[in-house]
């Protein structure tokens, strides 16, 4: 369950957390504290909907250890970090005669070919089909023979050279040369039944966060792939109304395992692409799940190549507190893959589930004999542990009451990681390097670069980590810089958003307060988007913007221009978010507090946060509202149905209403199975419908897209039915043929306009 990624700048995403940070200069009201004397315009709803003030990104693609590609005025340029200069790689006029609108491009690793993507048709969150053509950069012409078929589901270059693997009609094909015929690797693909090299709905959404289920070995010899079998998986069916002229609505059918239902089964194979023949069919060698997984339902949850002939697979039991990593070597004499029991590594949790959302990926050393992995330590904080493949125990190389977010690069001398250690702010992100010969030697590479403006970093390393791009996303305006790993010197500013900064000087912008409250001797962080000229002696209406799903974070140091910016700037509403029990990046004690008990503590903590906010003196406790999307819609609904008396109104967009309606992988991770022997009682106790009577005390707006493949319209339909059955007056809006993101241009504008009217009416604003 993730929030809609298409909603601008991820307002609704599960990210956010901050500290009492210095408010970035660009966010402060300039000139005067007197609102009446400030003649500057505010940030309006139209500004948000029309994206008047655009954050500039600097997207790059590393193609070597010192070069990256980037786009400028639709030309593709190559930047050489060694010499500090740019040159045109491909002019935008190259494809003037192409006749198609190019959606994306991908250069082969040897730089000889460019794959052009067009006819993009979205499927689910990550999946899509498209058409592809290949352009020969040496001959400066399109390859017209043996083209990749239309409606291809996935294409990927080999890591070196220019082999191509692609999936079409649920089967895998390999091209050794772009202009030669493809070799067919699988023959079993069947729509909605057998998926080779691509994920089914639940694996795409909840396991791999990708459509691809193909993994090239580092030198492109082997192609590993998963096969998913959805034969027994029940179908979700919903109407798709389409064009007005369609007399009978189309029925969409998707294999979708709900909690407790039959799951897809998975098999894993490796094929040697160097021994493909046009005479005989390709031989794929299966690597079976370890026996400890085969004895029950299980998932494949991670695939990582360690060396050219060593692969690691992570398997997870359906009850997701136990996982096993297999490390498998190619045995040339038998042509099989051997996975020694001595090299199996178990990861388990006694307090919850394994990993943040799934077991973390291993980062192997060059020889493939050891790896680094983020796991929970004895104190329940996620840190980096060093494993040798033949040893069961590992050595933690980081420690503290903070968490490592991700391992970003590994060289022979250093490991680079992102953590939230700096200044004890869980909602910050900084880049660190740790010396592998001495784990006590840790350097923060980003902490002091621009500490007021930049407290939330991500990074992109070149192929061998000689250079890196730092992407600062807040609390000030985004800043992109290029650095050398040799001395960690800043080489150049790539984008500083100075033009936007200038524009925003003329706007009454909100400020962001980031702090924590202490409940039961535990720090819980919150953020507040405060109106311009905020005066703590005045009373303001407050909107609680909630997500609150497991391992979520809504209080952070990220700069955003979103609906909250409008509400604070123009309507003088405080928009607050709070990370209670269940939230992430602060240790398992907080995150696993809601294990097997969704709809309890995380809901109670949002109510308690609102109570705490109303005691701060500047909140009008008669005008407190709550809103959320997806899991946030569930929490919003549970809060409004709690009968707390704290909230006047609220909006739930695409909410879960009963956990038996949501998918198996996500739901069972936290709730176990909906069976009498396991956790059925709590499944039934945690529904929104069971709280229907309490909605008489609040104003409620319920919104859902009718074509939501993720949180099905069924969930809101059942809330609506329960409310009607007990005579609750409420407001509702559906969005025809919209999915979980409600992201089409017209629907996006409509929903935010509609929600704005509702909030203004609730708060008695003109």
């Amino acid at each position: 369950m993730k929030t809609p990624w298409k909603v601008l700048l991820g307002l609704l995403g599960a990210a956010a957390l901050v500290t009492i940070i210095t408010v970035p200069v660009v966010l402060l009201n300039k000139g005067t504290d007197d609102a009446t004397a400030d003649s500057r315009k505010t940030y309006t709803l139209t500004d948000y909907l029309k994206n008047t003030y655009r954050l500039k990104l600097y997207s790059l693609r590393w193609i070597s250890d010192h070069e990256y590609l980037y786009k400028q005025e639709n030309n593709i340029l190559v930047f050489n970090a060694e010499y500090g200069n740019s040159s045109v790689f491909l002019e935008n006029s190259t494809f003037d005669e192409f006749g198609h609108s190019i959606n994306d491009y991908s250069i082969s690793p040897d730089g000889q070919f460019i794959l052009l993507e067009y006819n993009y048709v979205k499927q689910w969150r990550h999946s899509y089909t498209a058409s592809y053509d290949i352009y020969d950069l040496n001959k400066r012409q399109l390859i017209t023979e043996e083209r990749i078929p239309n409606n291809t589901q996935w294409v990927t270059w080999s890591p070196v050279g220019h082999k191509l693997a692609y999936v079409w009609n649920n089967d895998i094909y390999v091209k050794i040369e772009p202009n030669l015929p493809s070799y067919r690797i699988t023959w079993t693909g069947k729509e909605d039944i057998i998926y080779n090299g691509i994920t089914d709905w639940v694996y795409e959404e909840e396991v791999f966060s990708a459509y691809s289920a193909l993994w090239w070995s580092p030198n492109g010899t082997f192609l590993a792939y998963a096969q998913f079998n959805d034969t027994e998986v029940p179908l979700i069916e919903y109407s798709f109304y389409s064009d007005e002229s369609l007399q009978y609505p189309k029925t969409v059918r998707v294999p979708y395992p709900k909690a407790g239902a039959v799951n897809p089964t998975v098999k894993f194979f490796v094929v040697n692409t160097d021994s493909l023949s046009s005479v005989t069919n390709a031989t794929s060698i299966q690597i079976t799940a370890p026996a400890s997984m085969l004895i029950g339902d299980h998932y494949l949850c991670d695939v990582t190549w360690a060396t050219q002939e060593r692969i690691s697979l992570q398997w997870l039991r359906r009850i997701q507190n136990y996982s096993v990593m297999d490390i498998c070597d190619y045995d040339e004499s038998s042509g099989r893959w051997n996975c020694l029991v001595a090299r199996q590594h178990i990861e388990m949790s006694t307090t919850g589930w394994v990993g943040r959302f799934r077991p973390s990926e291993p980062h192997f050393t060059l020889d493939g004999n050891s790896f680094y992995k983020i796991i929970s330590n004895e104190e329940g904080y996620r840190h980096i542990c060093y494993f040798q493949i033949d040893k069961k125990d590992c050595t933690f190389i980081t420690k503290g009451t903070w968490e490592v977010i991700g391992i970003e690069a590994l060289t022979s001398d250093y490991l680079y990681y992102i953590s939230n250690e700096y200044k004890g702010m869980p909602g910050g992100r900084n880049l660190y390097k740790i010396q592998l010969s001495d784990y006590t030697k840790v350097t923060c590479l980003s902490c002091e670069l621009n500490p007021e403006r930049c407290q939330y970093y991500s990074v992109s390393f070149s192929k061998e980590a000689k250079y890196y791009q730092l992407r600062c996303s807040g609390p000030g305006l985004p800043l992109y810089t290029l650095h050398s790993s040799v001395n960690d010197k800043g080489l150049r500013v790539l984008e500083d958003n100075s033009a936007l900064d200038k524009m925003l000087q003329n706007v009454q912008m909100p400020s962001k307060k980031l702090d924590f409250i202490i409940l039961n001797e535990t720090k819980f962080w919150y953020q507040m988007i405060l109106p311009p000229h905020f005066d703590k002696s005045k009373k303001y209406p407050l909107l609680l913007d909630v997500y609150a799903g497991p391992c979520s974070q809504k209080a952070d140091t990220v700069f955003r221009l979103n609906w909250a910016t409008y509400l604070a700037s123009t309507e003088n509403i405080i928009v607050a978010s709070f990370d209670g029990r269940g939230s992430g990046y602060q240790g398992d004690k907080i995150m696993h507090a809601i294990n097997r008990r969704l709809g309890t503590f995380e809901v109670e903590d949002q109510i308690e946060a609102a109570r705490q906010f109303s005691k701060m003196g500047f909140v009008d406790n008669k005008r407190i509202a709550i809103w959320g999307w997806s899991y946030g819609g569930y929490v919003t609904s549970m809060v409004l149905g709690s009968g707390s008396g704290v909230f006047k109104c609220g909006i739930a967009v695409a909410p879960v209403s009963r956990w038996e309606y949501y998918d198996s992988v996500y739901t069972e991770r936290y709730m176990g199975l909906p069976t009498p022997e396991d956790n059925l009682d709590h499944y039934r106790n945690s529904t929104v419908m069971s709280r229907a009577e309490n909605f008489k005390q609040v104003e409620y707006l319920l919104i859902h897209g009718t074509a939501d493949d993720n949180v099905h319209f069924q969930q809101s339909a059942q809330i609506s039915k329960a409310l009607v059955d007990v005579g609750v007056d409420f407001q509702a809006m559906w969005y025809t043929d919209e999915d979980h993101g409600i992201a089409s241009s017209t629907a996006h504008q409509h929903i935010y306009t509609h929600m704005s009217h509702f909030i203004k009416q609730c708060f008695s604003l003109p």
Partner: antibody
Framework: EVQLVESGGGLVQPGGSLRLSCAAS????????IHWVRQAPGKGLEWVAW????????YYADSVKGRFTISADTSKNTAYLQMNSLRAEDTAVYYC????????????WGQGTLVTVSS | DIQMTQSPSSLSASVGDRVTITCRAS??????VAWYQQKPGKAPKLLIF???GLYSGVPSRFSGSGSGTDFTLTISSLQPEDFATYYC?????????FGQGTKVETK
């Protein structure tokens, strides 16, 4: 040299109990899967149970579930099969076998021990 | 449970003959099939795994093939020491199951 030596077989009455041992040498049972497979006189092979000592996992054939218990003592590098409520149809040679890989194939077998259930 | 059906149940052959034994699974087991050789009064020995992978130390006259439901063990040139009973086994899912055996006897 890899060796698996079974012991503990013998004659037992129906309803009785027996404990078979499988002593391993030349490898550590923590780094392998241990299976028990039986063969009734003049018949084929029937898989009985499996244990992964390090992971603490066990699994049984339906025909013995609830009556037989597989266990291991890693300090002694030995696996056990506790057989209760024995029936005449449990009469067989019982082999322990191991595999060092994560698949359930058996690359090394003991010589077997005969269990006879008869009144 | 997956049933493994071997054929023939017995066969007579001479030294130097090419011998083929087949095994059919009641459902798809991919290539998760092993073959064992057992001599009277002795424990079984692993010959083939992964349908066609020769276990170390096993003579190259033994080979295996097949995928899905149909599998074959072939002895290219029967040697005196090859007279024994052969079993197939699936390890695609639990419970593990064996074929009923094929006895290779002297003609």
């Amino acid at each position: 040299e890899v060796q698996l030596v079974e012991s503990g077989g013998g004659l037992v009455q129906p309803g009785g109990s027996l404990r078979l041992s499988c002593a391993a040498s030349g490898f550590t049972i923590n780094d392998s899967y241990i299976h028990w497979v039986r063969q009734a006189p003049g018949k084929g092979l029937e898989w009985v149970a499996w244990i992964w000592p390090y992971g603490g996992f066990t699994y049984y054939a339906d025909s013995v579930k609830g009556r037989f218990t597989i266990s291991a003592d890693t300090s002694k590098n030995t696996a056990y099969l506790q057989m209760n409520s024995l029936r005449a149809e449990d009469t067989a040679v019982y082999y322990c076998a191991r595999f060092l890989g994560s698949s359930s194939i058996m690359d090394y077998w003991g010589q077997g021990t005969l269990v006879t259930v008869s009144s | 449970d997956i049933q493994m059906t071997q054929s023939p149940s017995s066969l007579s052959a001479s030294v130097g003959d090419r011998v083929t034994i087949t095994c059919r699974a009641s459902q798809d087991v991919n290539s998760n099939v092993a073959w064992y050789q057992q001599k009277p009064g002795k424990a079984p020995k692993l010959l083939i795994f992964g349908s066609g992978g020769l276990y170390s130390g096993v003579p190259s006259r033994f080979s295996g093939s097949g995928s899905g439901t149909d599998f074959t063990l072939t002895i290219s040139s029967l040697q005196p020491e090859d007279f024994a009973t052969y079993y197939c086994q699936q390890y695609s899912s639990y419970p593990l199951t064996f074929g009923q055996g094929t006895k290779v006897e002297t003609k």
